[in-house]
């Protein structure tokens, strides 16, 4: 996911509403102007504000990365809300990244849940009832390029 | 070990079909992506389009959308891409590569050299 | 489509030097940055992912940093095996796209 950062607003434009502060603070889907006198809407798909606040800027909406899926729009009072796509489930260790799960389990082991965006396959042992958490890699990731001569091009 | 045995240089003529090979061993492709890229010569890298193999999805570069249909045989461990109505500037060698993570490739084949030419 | 730009496109350096490889995206893709090394006849290999993490395999010396939209590649101490082409990629949005490659050669 992108980071969320704040948005830099440029000077409100006409069609940006405007209401005054309620004890210094703008209500959700607004920010503080720089004078503290004026309320100023977020911009819908492009910034927001969850709670009541003196924010000079909107924090700026999130993107879902490549590896993700929109479940929900940004809009001006919630931020956008990103998921892993189908197939794949976002790591404990590695919160930023959605990794494949795995398809089958060891050999010895059945299936005991099923992929999902927050987790892994988990898989139990046929004999014991012993839960494999699935988070130990079906494949290797230790980088090399396959043997043999390529017919590549020189760069 | 890991490895992505592609298949042999093609020679082809304009406007006909090529389908190129990347046979998996050392792991279930399932349990990956597959990725294509171009490299024609002497130039950089152009990502095509990539397969998960466990459902069949398929994302392509736009630019290769109509030209290259990526697919997959999961009972052999195989990937496929199949180039269309081929011009000289598909000239060039194809890589199919994987990633346990969508976003980068760790492990490439050994390049197709596919060649354009009437 | 984001546009990777990398610059110099050709940096000459001595072996034991210091080599920095630099990477630009034309709009932000937080640290989806990945850098590869190609040598002449063979498929590029993974040197480093998301940035800055290292890859089991690749030597200590290849180093990179960034976030955002400048990235750089670091080679501390440039031996023989390391002259070759560099390529960053951003995973961050479809399509993918690459940068267009430095030649790294002796000086």
């Known amino acids: 996911i992108t980071q969320q950062d704040l948005a830099p607003q440029q000077r409100a434009a006409p069609q940006q509403k405007r209401s005054s502060p309620s004890e210094g603070l703008c209500p959700p889907g607004h920010h503080i102007s720089e004078d503290g006198r004026d309320c100023i809407s977020c911009k819908y798909g492009q910034d927001y504000s969850t709670h009541w606040n003196d924010l000079l800027f909107c924090l700026r909406c999130t993107r879902c990365d490549s590896g993700e899926v929109e479940l929900s729009p940004c809009t001006t009072t919630r931020n956008t809300v990103c998921q892993c796509e189908e197939g794949t489930f976002r790591e404990e260790d590695s919160p930023e990244m959605c990794r494949k799960c795995r398809t089958g389990c060891p050999r010895g082991m059945v299936k005991l849940t099923s992929c999902t965006p927050r987790e892994n396959r988990k898989c139990v042992s046929k004999t014991s009832g012993t839960k494999h958490s699935g988070e130990v890699p079906a494949v290797e990731e230790t980088v090399t390029s396959s043997p043999g001569t390529p017919a590549s091009p020189c760069s | 070990e890991v490895q992505l045995q592609q298949s042999g240089a093609e020679v082809v003529k304009p406007g006909a079909s090529v389908k190129l090979s990347c046979k998996a061993s050392?792991?279930?492709?399932?349990?990956?992506?597959i990725h294509w890229v171009k490299q024609a010569p002497g130039q950089g890298l152009e990502w095509i389009g990539r397969?998960?193999?466990?459902?069949?999805?398929?994302k392509y570069d736009p630019k290769f959308q109509g030209k290259a249909t990526i697919t997959t045989d999961t009972s052999s461990n195989t990937a496929y891409m199949e180039l269309s109505s081929l011009r000289s500037e598909d000239t060039a060698v194809y890589y199919c590569?994987?990633?346990?993570?969508?976003?980068?490739?760790?492990?490439w084949g050994q390049g197709t050299l596919v060649t354009v030419s009437s | 489509e984001i546009v990777m730009t990398q610059s110099p496109a050709t940096l000459s350096v001595s072996p034991g030097e210091r080599a920095t490889l630099s990477c630009r995206a034309s709009?932000?893709?937080?640290?989806?940055l990945h850098w590869y090394q190609q040598k002449p006849g063979q498929a590029p290999r993974l040197l480093i992912k998301?940035?800055?993490q290292s890859i089991t395999g690749i030597p200590a010396r290849f180093s990179g940093s960034g976030s955002g939209t400048e990235f750089t590649l670091t080679i501390s101490s440039l031996q023989s095996e390391d002259f070759a082409v560099y390529y960053c990629q951003q995973g961050n949005s479809w399509p993918y796209t690459f940068g267009q490659g430095t030649k790294l050669e002796i000086k």
């Open positions: 050392g792991f279930n492709i399932k349990d990956t992506f």
């Open positions: 590569v994987r990633g346990l993570y969508t976003y980068y490739f760790d492990y």
């Open positions: 709009q932000s893709i937080s640290n989806n």
């Open positions: 397969i998960d193999p466990a459902n069949g999805n398929t």
């Open positions: 998301f940035a800055s």
